[in-house]
Amino acid sequence: KKVVLGKKGDTVELTCTASQKKSIQFHWKNSNQIKILGNQGSFLTKGPSKLNDRADSRRSLWDQGNFPLIIKNLKIEDSDTYICEVEDQKEEVQLLVFGLTANSDTHLLQGQSLTLTLESPPGSSPSVQCRSPRGKNIQGGKTLSVSQLELQDSGTWTCTVLQNQKKVEFKIDIVVLAFQKASSIVYKKEGEQVEFSFPLAFTVEKLTGSGELWWQAERASSSKSWITFDLKNKEVSVKRVTQDPKLQMGKKLPLHLTLPQALPQYAGSGNLTLALEAKTGKLHQEVNLVVMRATQLQKNLTCEVWGPTSPKLMLSLKLENKEAKVSKREKAVWVLNPEAGMWQCLLSDSGQVLLESNIKVLPTWSTPVQP
């Protein structure tokens, strides 16, 4: 008995060939011996089987002695043994229809689990192997699970179902809903305008939800909500914003926040959460603000940074075009009785300058000028 594998929703063509290369009488029946279709001369006739409105043949092939059964929009319950009767012969074809679906939505939040469920006909014992877009292979039976989805899992998953040494391939498009970056750091001099951007790593036609930015200032004992907003069809509208600082928010995606000026009291870490409509869970992006201030008070030139800096960062004070006078893995450095000239305060990581602030030290009889 010939075995044919089909995919739920697809079309399958079961072949039946007569030795005579001409149009003769034929019938396709199901295992209950109920007629699906056949011919009456050059006319196609259909029986009362459940396949009635989804079964067809190719009249153009009848003259060549070919009498296919075409089944459209396959269902799992179409799995059956189909019998073609032609020239006093019976040809049997076993059709096995499989379906593979993501048990939840195919749009999943980063960190969530993906479960792929195989629908299969009773009595079948298929094996499934899926390959993720980043090349990871997973194997299973009726269900396959992948926990902790990552951004790289977005894309087309290719799954192969194997049964009776035959295989059928499914492709499922998975979208992992996440921000492009899990975390970002913004380095700013005191007084500068700060731009926070939260680009999404996916595109969908309609995006609706709500979000909030919570901020933990380094100097504050507790975190506070800086802004709440709504997202409707990719349009952003602010619901509530603190008076200090008074953030501004862009009306379109990507989510964009502007802090009018960087001040030491704002330095710290924020967590932007985005709750999407019809999704359980939230998207998160951490954002950090590091603020630098260079000051000269009497005979003391000081450079300070506030905010989440890593211990390996180096803070230096140097006179322009000269070697650093002071370099420390600390958040404040100073020089007593600095020479006149343009001093640079540098925050660097392995030689790469992250933040720079210049201060002009005048001869001792003058007051300092900050450019």
């Epitope: 209950n32 009456q40 029986g47």
Partner: antibody, heavy 120, light 107 residues
């Protein structure tokens, strides 16, 4: 066991639409074809058409342009609408279940029938 | 559509008689034929399917035969409760069609 009960107006005016409902009790409506058959007084049986629980239909070509069938699985009901009726549509209307088994295809369960008269 | 022609349209026989009804199809319908019994004021009841197989609970005095285009229905020994109209119905192809019916009466 499964029982069928037709319901609907017994009198319909010419050119109007005849509407009948069949309620299935004692079993599930799912995974069967459900058909409508009519019988004018003193005459034979005419198959009007059938509907599967998925909503797919097959109608008798002689009535196709006037027939609409629908199914409501939540209520275990299926219905028939026949538009632009004339006196020739006066008949007893039956609903029935079509059953397929091995070497078997027949209407094994019938309603008791409801008489519909088309008259002004 | 497949036309089903039944004959006779009516017959009268005595209790205990053998009664035969014929049904002819306009096309070859293999053995895709049912026989129904309809008593006055009642819905039809399926007696025979697949041309010759008795439905469960149907008395063995009823039988069917035939294949292709010609079929017969027989009541071996007519009983008073057999007074009814008998219909053949093909299920080879849609639309499902019935014969015109044979009314069986007792003399």
């Amino acid at each position: 066991q499964v029982q069928l009960q037709e319901s609907g107006p017994g009198l319909v005016k010419p050119s109007e639409t005849l509407s009948l409902t069949c309620t299935v009790s004692g079993g599930s409506i799912s995974s069967f074809y459900w058909s409508w058959i009519r019988q004018p007084a003193g005459k034979g049986l005419e198959w009007i058409g059938r509907i599967y629980t998925s909503g797919s239909t097959n109608y008798n070509p002689s009535l196709k342009s006037r027939v609409t069938m629908s199914v409501d699985t939540s209520k275990n009901q299926f219905s028939l609408k026949l538009s632009s009726v004339t006196a020739a549509d006066t008949a007893v209307y039956y609903c029935a279940r079509e059953l397929e088994k091995r070497n078997y295809y027949g209407m094994d369960v019938w309603g008791q029938g409801t008489t519909v008269t088309v008259s002004s | 559509d497949i036309q089903m022609t039944q004959s006779p349209s009516s017959l009268s026989a005595s209790v205990g008689d053998r009664v035969t009804i014929t049904c002819q199809a306009s096309h070859d319908i293999s053995n895709y034929l049912n026989w129904y019994q309809q008593k006055p004021g009642k819905a039809p009841k399926l007696l025979i399917f697949d041309a010759s197989t008795l439905e469960t609970g149907v008395p063995s005095r009823f039988s069917g035969s035939g294949s292709g285009t010609y079929f017969t229905f027989t009541i071996r020994s007519l009983q008073p409760e057999d007074i009814a109209t008998y219909y053949c119905q093909q299920y080879d192809s849609l639309p499902l069609t019935f014969g015109g019916g044979t009314k069986v009466e007792i003399k």
